[in-house]
């Protein structure tokens, strides 16, 4: 999906109002310095591409993020403010249903959510030069 036509300011507002808090709740009890940020993004569409991938694509050691509240709200924000996004997710949803696992918070999931926090922060500062 091409995130170029999303309403970035509305997505930013949703992030600042709630998704950020849900991410913090998920990470509660974890030191902010515990994980190094290894995933980066260069502009808002790229950030949303990376955010979608990390939030919804199961990875080795972390298959359970899609059912978290921050993930549901992320998906809603993309569906509401990115024209045509929902239509692109139908096939992905069918695949997800086949491999859904019960929610388990692993260290790998905490690391992944830490990466997500970094991507969202970058999304909110689009004018900053890439380090």
């Amino acid at each position: 999906y091409d995130f170029t036509n999303c309403d970035f300011e509305k997505i930013k507002a949703a992030y600042l109002s709630t998704i950020s808090k849900d991410l913090i709740t998920y990470m509660s009890g974890t030191k902010s310095t515990e994980f190094n940020n290894t995933v980066s993004c260069s502009n808002r569409p790229h950030c949303l591409t990376e955010i979608q991938s990390l939030t919804f694509n199961p990875t080795a050691g972390c298959a359970s993020l899609a059912k978290e509240m921050f993930a549901m709200k992320t998906k809603a924000a993309l569906a509401i403010w990115c024209p045509g996004y929902s239509e692109t997710q139908i096939n992905a949803t069918q695949a997800m249903k086949k491999r859904r696992k019960r929610k388990v918070t692993t260290n790998k999931c905490l690391e992944q959510v830490s990466q997500l926090q970094g991507l969202w922060r970058r999304f909110n500062r689009p004018l900053l030069k890439q380090q």
Epitope: A14, S17, T18, I19, K73, I80, W81, P83, S86
Partner: nanobody, 117 residues
Amino acid sequence: EVQLVESGGGLVQPGGSLRLSCAASGLTFGTHVMGWFRQAPGKERELVTAINPAALTTYYADSVKGRFTISADNSKNTAYLQMNSLKPEDTAVYYCARDFWSAGDSWGQGTLVTVSS
């Protein structure tokens, strides 16, 4: 002050249908995303569906896709949730929210939906 009032809940048999309504006052309806959350006993609150009345874009949780339909009537300042093919696992208190990220002051009091034979 924003007020959201849900109605339409009740007891229904599995496979049955219900239509929930959310009447809003104190806000310009078409400029806000309207959402429905639900909370089953002993479970976390879940975002079920949301609609942007201005763009007519919608979100549905995977668990309700194809069974639930959200709509909005800007002239009546009301959002609707049509629930078909109801399952026992749909039993919950359903809450309407102005903007799916809104704080507690922008929530209704909830309406109970019970799916049981």
